[in-house]
Interface confidence: low
């Protein structure tokens, strides 16, 4: 039975040209995290593999930085970066946990961070 929950930064907003940290945290389980995938819609952004370390997809190398921790930093944001982002935790023996973050990239200088929320 999967007992864990993923806490994410939830709905967040940031300014065009700026940067933002996407963060997920898996709790309430003793399962071993073997890999975390970061995806935007159907595109793979990055992988953090417990054995092999970080890999950033070639098309995002200039604008994506690993960390902090298992999180991901997006840089030089554009309005096109607005959308859903997913952290996918591969664990043993539980299986896969997925967290969702919605990022809105704003033209103006008013960018507020949303509340944190949990996905069971």
């Amino acid at each position: 039975m999967m007992t864990g929950t993923i806490e994410t930064t939830g709905n967040i907003s940031a300014e065009k040209g700026g940067s933002i940290i996407l963060q997920c945290h898996l709790s309430s389980t003793t399962a071993q995290v073997t890999q975390v995938n970061w995806e935007q819609q159907d595109q793979l952004l990055a992988i953090c593999n417990a054995d092999l370390g970080w890999h950033i997809s070639p098309s995002f190398k200039d604008r994506v930085a690993p960390g902090p921790g298992l999180g991901l930093t997006l840089q030089s944001l554009t309005v096109n970066d607005t959308g859903e982002y997913f952290c996918i935790y591969h664990t043993y023996p539980d299986g896969t946990y997925t967290g969702r973050i919605f990022l809105e990239v704003l033209e103006s200088s008013v960018a507020e961070h949303g509340a944190r929320f949990q996905i069971p």
Partner: antibody, heavy 122, light 106 residues
Framework: QMQLVQSGSELKKPGASVKVSCKAS????????MNWVRQAPGQGLEWMGW????????TYAQGFTGRFVFSLDTSVSTAYLQISSLKAEDTAVYYC???????????????WGQGTTVTVSS | DIQLTQSPSFLSASVGDRVTITCRAS??????LAWYQQKPGKAPKLLIY???TLQSGVPSRFSGSGSGTEFTLTISSLQPEDFATYYC????????FGGGTKVEIK
């Protein structure tokens, strides 16, 4: 040229142990992870796990914990697979296979040993 | 673990035929897929990695394509030495192999 040479075939009784060796040559042994792959008679390929040849840290696939141990002797560029408490279902060809590097991009198996047949029979 | 499903399991073809083998992943694996050829009594041989990159020394009649969950290995003109079993292999996560496709002489 780069190659992996494995030890010869083994015939063992149930409950015994076996140690298969895989000697690398033609490249820097510690620069590439080593995998172990099992192929039961008439069956497909099954990844058993791998060992980081830099640190000696092993990673075991599901179903290959407990009786299976990966080890190294870097002084002779050799990886080892030891299987204890052998069962009839361990009868298979065991391959060592080099991974192309330590990043996910390179994680295909570019060099394989010739395979070692382990037969477990009473 | 990520499951790989190969189709067909068996394929009968003639020398000169164009042959296509499909590999489907249970979840998106980007382009982290390799293809191997195995002949009876021999070790597998790497043909394609990163879904479409030909391994050094492999004939150009072999090609790979696909991304995400669906991949194909194509042999443009089957040669006598190509009759063998072919396996796909995902390399994004803990490695898994497809069940294999045996290419036999018609």
């Amino acid at each position: 040229q780069m190659q992996l040479v494995q030890s010869g075939s083994e015939l063992k009784k149930p409950g015994a142990s076996v140690k298969v060796s895989c000697k690398a040559s033609g490249y820097t042994f510690t620069s590439y992870p080593m995998n172990w792959v099992r192929q039961a008679p008439g069956q497909g390929l099954e990844w058993m796990g791998w060992i980081n040849t830099n640190t000696g840290n092993p990673t075991y696939a599901q179903g290959f914990t407990g009786r299976f141990v990966f080890s190294l002797d870097t002084s002779v560029s050799t990886a080892y697979l030891q299987i204890s408490s052998l069962k009839a279902e361990d009868t298979a060809v065991y391959y060592c296979a080099r991974t192309g590097g330590y990043s996910v991009d390179e994680y295909s198996f570019d060099i394989w040993g010739q395979g070692t047949t382990v037969t477990v029979s009473s | 673990d990520i499951q790989l499903t190969q189709s067909p399991s068996f394929l009968s073809a003639s020398v000169g035929d164009r042959v296509t083998i499909t590999c489907r992943a249970s979840q998106g694996i980007s382009s982290y897929l390799a293809w191997y050829q195995q002949k009876p009594g021999k070790a597998p041989k790497l043909l394609i990695y990163a879904a479409s990159t030909l391994q050094s020394g492999v004939p150009s009649r072999f090609s790979g394509s696909g991304s995400g969950t669906e991949f194909t290995l194509t042999i443009s003109s089957l040669q006598p030495e190509d009759f063998a079993t072919y396996y796909c292999h995902q390399t994004i996560f803990r490695p898994t192999f497809g069940g294999g496709t045996k290419v036999e002489i018609k």
